[in-house]
């Protein structure tokens, strides 16, 4: 079906070849050795798209066999495929590196949706498109999965970013980002700029397209625009963080903080959509809902089940707001807030039927594991995850998708009073039920 | 109900070869990992060798490596232990075990039920 | 490998006592422990798994406890059905290894 409007787009930055990288000039001091600048060798070493991940390139073992790493802020360990798969191209073969360490340990890990359990070990890792290092990191070598792998997706294990405590087993099995830190003069510090290409990319479009940039060590400012404003991670497990006030174009949710935060807050590159606790999702669908009324979607859209299409260059992106989340600042009372456009938050899908419309999926969803910050806001955003401060900062994204209208905007201050009451304290329960969380 | 029935044991001479079978009725067979386990006469339980649902991962305990092979057949819902190069060591009750589940490391998938064992006796 | 310690060797005790089985582990198992009961001349059965979770049909009076090296098996008011070999087994390291068994036997 189309739907509405013609607007034709792409034609401001949005239509941009990925590639694109606006210059920026600045006069900020560095605020430590080799945390700012120029990171030329990693920027545009990520692939991917939102609904698939974006991944990395990395080598493991010796010789190096290079593998497709998917990018996750979500969970912390480092696993690779190692057997035989339908939808692996290549796999880790322990067998044939003289450096793999056995750790005659098994690992489970399960997904909200999927699963993979494998066997530890070490090895020698690196990142051709990152430091110049190699490190002796655990891996999880996947034996057998369900429902985790993905076909056509092009990676083969995924990066668990995230802090030892959420780490499988248990954790005393240190994250790779851990060793990388522990073993190098890598600062602790990472930073993301995931690129949404606005439209949907066939198989050989991501192979040959950029997906964006992992900085490791550093900021590159060629990445963004603007200034970097930074959240506090409240608790080391997670990235977590706290949102302290949702406005859907600019109208206050006007509910009790804590809700947004409950069960806690993320941001993770792992999961696609902007996730949101049930009873945020219904007031931020409702909202969203009546802004959009000038035309009705039906209610398999507001699911994420459904596709809605218009014919090619006509989205109505006027008819959809911007969704602001605030976060909390560094300074007490002081909050910002983070605004994303629809085109984060519609994705672009292909609808094999009517491939000359432009379809896409809602990709805000409800969850019961609490707020993730998923690639659909993190594609507005240059994200940097500083570890050595406890903090995380968002940047406008050089390459993010928008129009001649709207953009996407990091913005502050604005005061704030009790933020701290905005965050949810989890009841202690057994480590085991805990649930890496997925969309 | 779920049914486990081992056979293939007998009396071999050291060196000499065997090959366990298990059937197994009752459940979907190729959902669940499945393990072998031995009681030597008097004596306690040692675990000999695990396999996944699929049959993609095995394991086995150091006493056996490289002599004993686990696999399965999911068509023919049986388990197999092919062993070779037998010591008398290796005289023992073999039990076969159904796991908890296809993973072997998840929460809660522990070996239960086992079938009633079949007797290997290595001996000249 | 990880060595699993059963004590004691022999437990004699009469119906309706209370019977507490050690279990202690040479390097952390996690909660990666299960008891297992077995008769003479019968396969072993589950009991407890995850160090602390009754199997499907186990009766309340069984029931484990802790995590990392030292676990306990008890069984709070012994039924004549219960005098039988117990085993505890580990699945958290390469290769799994049972103890060495508890006798529960009747005075």
């Known amino acids: 079906t189309q739907h509405g409007i013609r607007l034709p787009l792409r034609s401001g930055l949005g239509g941009a070849p990925l590639g694109l990288r606006l210059p920026r000039e600045t006069d900020e001091e560095p605020e430590e050795p080799g945390r700012r600048g120029s990171f030329v060798e990693m920027v545009d070493n990520l692939r991917g798209k939102s609904g698939q991940g974006y991944y990395v390139e990395m080598t493991v073992g010796s010789p190096p066999q290079t593998l497709n790493i998917l990018v996750d802020t979500g969970s912390s360990n480092f696993a690779v495929g190692a057997a035989p798969h339908p939808f692996l191209h290549r796999y880790y073969q322990r067998q044939l590196s003289s450096t793999y360490r056995d750790l005659r340990k098994g690992v489970y890990v399960p997904y909200t949706q999927g699963k993979w359990e494998g066997e530890l070990g070490t090895d020698l890792v690196s990142i051709p498109h990152g430091p110049n290092v190699t490190v002796r990191a655990n891996i999880a070598a996947i034996t057998e999965s369900d429902k985790f792998f993905i076909n056509g997706s092009n990676w083969e294990g995924i990066l668990g970013l995230a802090y030892a405590e959420i780490a499988r087993p248990d954790d005393s099995l240190e994250p790779f980002f851990d060793s990388l830190v522990k073993q190098t003069h890598v600062p602790n510090l990472f930073s993301l700029q995931l690129c949404g290409a606005g439209f949907p990319l066939n198989q050989s479009e991501v192979l040959a397209s950029v997906g964006g940039s992992m900085i490791i060590g550093g900021i590159d400012h060629s990445l963004y625009t603007g200034s970097l404003w930074y959240t506090p991670i409240r608790r080391e497990w997670y990235y977590e963080v706290i949102i302290v006030r949702v406005e859907i174009n600019g109208q206050d949710l006007k509910m009790d903080c804590k809700e947004y935060n409950y069960d806690k807050s993320i941001v993770d590159s792992g999961t696609t959509n902007l996730r949101l606790p049930k009873k945020v999702f219904e007031a931020a669908v409702k909202s969203i809902k009546a802004a959009s009324s000038t035309e009705k979607f039906p209610d398999g859209f507001w699911l994420g089940e459904q596709l809605v299409c218009w014919q090619a260059g006509t989205t109505p992106w006027n008819i959809f707001p911007v969704i602001s989340l605030y976060l909390m600042g560094e300074v007490t009372n002081q909050s910002f807030r983070i605004t994303i456009l629809p085109q984060q938050y519609l994705r672009p899908v292909e609808d094999v039927a009517t491939s000359q419309d432009d379809c896409y999926k809602f990709a805000i969803s409800q969850s019961s594991t609490g707020t993730v910050m998923g690639a659909v806001i993190m594609e507005g955003f240059y994200v940097v995850f500083d570890r050595a401060r406890k903090r995380i900062g968002f940047a406008v994204s050089a390459c993010h998708v928008h129009d001649e209208f709207r953009t996407a905007a990091v913005e502050g201050p604005f005061v704030t009073l009790d933020m701290e009451d905005c965050g949810y304290n989890i009841p202690q329960t057994d480590e085991s039920t805990l649930m890496t969380g997925r969309a | 109900e779920v049914q486990l029935l081992e056979s293939g044991g007998g009396l071999v001479q050291p060196g000499g070869s065997l090959r366990l079978s298990c059937a197994a009725s009752g459940f979907t067979f190729s959902s669940y990992a499945m393990s072998w386990v031995r009681q030597a006469p008097g004596k306690g339980l040692e675990w000999v060798s695990a396999?996944?649902?699929?049959?993609?991962?095995?394991y086995y305990a150091d006493s056996v490596k490289g002599r004993f092979t686990i696999s399965r057949d999911n068509s023919k819902n049986t388990l197999y232990l092919q062993m070779n190069s037998l010591r008398a060591e290796d005289t023992a009750v073999y039990y076969c075990?159904?796991?908890?589940?296809?993973?072997?490391?998840?929460?809660?998938?522990?070996?239960?039920?086992w079938g009633q064992g079949t007797l290997v006796t290595v001996s000249s | 490998e990880i060595v699993l310690t059963q004590s004691p060797a022999t437990l004699s005790l009469s119906p309706g006592e209370r019977a507490t089985l050690s279990c202690r582990a040479s390097q952390s198992v996690s909660s990666y422990l299960a008891w297992y009961q077995q008769k003479p001349g019968q396969a072993p059965r589950l009991l407890i798994y995850?160090?602390?979770n009754r199997a499907t049909g186990i009766p309340a009076r069984f029931s484990g406890s802790g995590s990392g090296t030292d676990f306990t098996l008890t069984i709070s008011s012994l039924e004549p059905e219960d005098f039988a070999v117990y085993y505890c087994v580990q699945r958290s390291n390469f290769p799994w290894t049972f103890g060495g068994g508890t006798k529960v036997e009747i005075k």
């Open positions: 075990a159904k796991g908890g589940s296809q993973w072997l490391y998840a929460p809660g998938s522990w070996f239960d039920p």
């Open positions: 995850d160090a602390s």
């Open positions: 396999i996944s649902g699929s049959g993609g991962s095995t």
